[in-house]
Interface confidence: low
């Protein structure tokens, strides 16, 4: 099915940018792995590169506005023509859940005091309003709470006195049309408007004041243009050459609004001054190679020695990485394929240990399953031997850093019946449901 093809994929927002056009296949659009595509029904924007996880979304709002709750965030497997990893298909969502607390306490309502006395009537003649008030302090609300109802109430009051009615102008009427539409005629164009003393009329008994000021207003018409000339399009110019050497590009035709040029405020030409067409080179774009992650360090050994484990004898170890994804004469990976370092082997060495402080609380697991919990640990961590941190391996090559390698066997005094790891678990509160954010938009 044809898709919308875009020239950019914005990692931070997951949005397609720079629409190239529609009516092309995913395969043609993704001849350039920097491009991105979107189904015509407004589906997800997918980059043309090989699939990988998107950035994590921002944390959703806390599930409760006060006391401890939980919040979710997600990331999505996006790309084209593959999977993010074994059994993780395109479009798959991965979730994280963590505890949160927007506000430590929840609001508590307060209670009203008794009503105070009525204030005097708001007017000295005819009918007005009077007001009384009460205070929200019996008891006072807590943690941003309030009292139900209103802090004041009003009622009508009558002074038994008749008020005079003073005259007031009604709104100005509309300006009359200008007496001319262009400058340069026999009479200077002008416009007029009027108003009436009827909002309200002044009373007779008791006598009210008349409206002040004039009932009519005149002004000159300003900014009247010379008579206008509408613009017209010239012919379409030649089609520009295809600007790309691989994948899809865009050619442009241009025309000018000059037959005639619009004058004296006449309308400009309607429609577009440019029109574009997709051009297809049918050539795949080069894809540069990218280093894969480093492999595991090899065992720490020293030539001509069977084992150096638990000895103050430096050895060597190496790790490798591979250059992946290079296609269509793209650049090779730069840098070294092998990494070598010096090491002390402490594999399976019994070392004196000490208990760490508590780690921070981890994420809630499972984020979308039943009864998620979070955990923290104390670990029996080994105390490393005081071997020299650098060695001089070959004359003239200077000092080399030496890294400890291997899994030792730390020994700590028992803590809560454990020798290596003490773990504490706690349930996560007010857990929201995991919902696909795309479905929530519908």
């Amino acid at each position: 099915d044809p898709v919308l093809c875009f020239t950019q994929y914005e990692e931070s927002s997951g949005k397609c940018k720079g629409l190239l056009g529609g009516g092309v296949s995913v395969k043609d659009c993704c001849l350039n792995t920097a491009y991105a595509y979107q189904e015509r029904n407004g589906g997800l924007c997918q980059p043309c590169r090989s699939p990988r996880w998107s950035l994590w979304s921002t944390w959703a709002p806390c599930s409760v506005t006060c006391s401890e709750g939980s919040q979710l965030r997600y990331r999505r497997c996006v790309g084209w023509n593959g999977q993010c990893s074994e059994r993780v298909a395109l479009g798959t969502l991965e979730w994280q859940l963590q505890a949160c607390e927007d506000k430590q306490c929840c609001p508590e309502m307060g209670g009203w005091s008794d009503w105070g006395p009525w204030e005097p009537c708001s007017v000295t003649c005819s009918k007005g309003m009077r007001t009384r008030r009460r205070a929200c302090d019996h008891p006072a609300p807590k943690c941003g709470g309030h009292c139900p109802g209103e802090a004041q109430e009003s009622e009508a009051c009558d002074t038994q006195q008749v008020c005079p009615t003073h005259g007031a102008w009604a709104a100005w009427g509309p300006w009359s049309p200008c007496s001319g539409s262009c400058h340069g005629g026999p009479h200077e164009p002008k416009e007029t408007r009027s108003r009436t003393c009827s909002a309200p009329e002044p009373s007779q008994k008791p006598p009210g004041k008349p409206c002040p000021g004039p009932a009519y207003e005149h002004r000159k018409c300003t900014g009247l243009p010379p008579c206008p000339v509408a613009g017209g399009w010239g012919p379409w110019g030649p089609v520009s050459p295809c600007p790309v050497t691989c994948g899809l590009g865009q050619t442009i035709e241009r025309r000018t609004c000059n037959r005639p040029v619009p004058q004296h405020g006449g309308p400009s030409c309607a429609g577009d001054a440019t029109r574009t067409h997709i051009c297809n080179t049918a050539v795949p774009c080069p894809v540069d190679g990218e280093w894969d992650l480093w492999g595991q360090w090899s065992t720490c050994v020293r030539r001509n020695m069977k084992s150096i484990s638990c000895e103050e004898i430096p050895g060597q170890q190496s790790r490798w990485r591979t250059c992946k994804g290079r296609k269509f004469d793209g650049h090779r990976c730069t840098g070294q394929q092998q990494d070598i370092r010096h090491c002390y082997s402490i594999q399976h060495c019994p070392l004196k240990g000490s208990w760490s402080e508590w780690s921070t609380w981890g994420l809630c697991m499972p984020p979308c399953g039943p009864n998620p919990t979070r955990a923290r640990q104390r670990l029996c961590t080994p105390l490393l031997p005081k071997y020299p941190p650098t060695v001089s391996m070959v004359e003239g090559q200077g000092e080399k850093n030496v890294t400890f390698w291997g899994r030792p066997l730390p020994r700590c005094e028992e803590l809560q019946g454990q020798k290596l790891v003490v773990e504490e678990k706690r349930p996560c509160l007010h857990v929201p449901a995991c919902k696909d954010p795309e479905e929530e938009k519908l």
């Epitope: 402080e357 640990q377 080994p382 899994r407 790891v421």
Partner: nanobody, 119 residues
């Protein structure tokens, strides 16, 4: 992953003082050893001072009596107080953190901070 970030480098006159700070953060349970190394132009990187989790210290002969290393184990921070600075102390100073947990050992380096001592 663990991040190591240094701060406090700068320009000082001979005989002046400077204080370097370093923090190790990220997915870290405990840093067993923290150290300062330095590398002058055209020379090998050399140990300046190191301090263990329990406070044991080691100093290079060239800085003994002038430099003091200290740390806050709870916050995984280390400080190098440098007094009576000499022109030969000019170098890029690197912070080093040696982490050890139940999965094995790993060594982490900062990006470095420039210290320049002018006469």
């Amino acid at each position: 992953q663990v991040q190591v970030v240094e701060s406090g480098g700068g320009l000082r006159q001979t005989g002046g003082s400077l204080r370097l700070s370093c923090t190790a953060s990220g997915r870290i349970f405990e840093v067993n050893m923290m150290a300062w190394y330095r590398q002058a132009p055209g020379k090998q990187r050399e140990l300046v001072a190191e301090i263990s989790r329990v406070g044991t210290t080691v100093y290079a002969d060239s800085v003994k009596g002038r430099f003091t290393i200290s740390r806050d184990s709870a916050k995984n921070t280390v400080t190098l107080q440098m007094n009576s600075l000499k022109s030969e102390d000019t170098a890029v100073y690197y912070c080093n953190a040696l982490q050890y947990d139940r999965y094995g050992g790993a060594e982490y380096w900062g990006q470095g901070t420039q210290v320049t001592v002018s006469s």
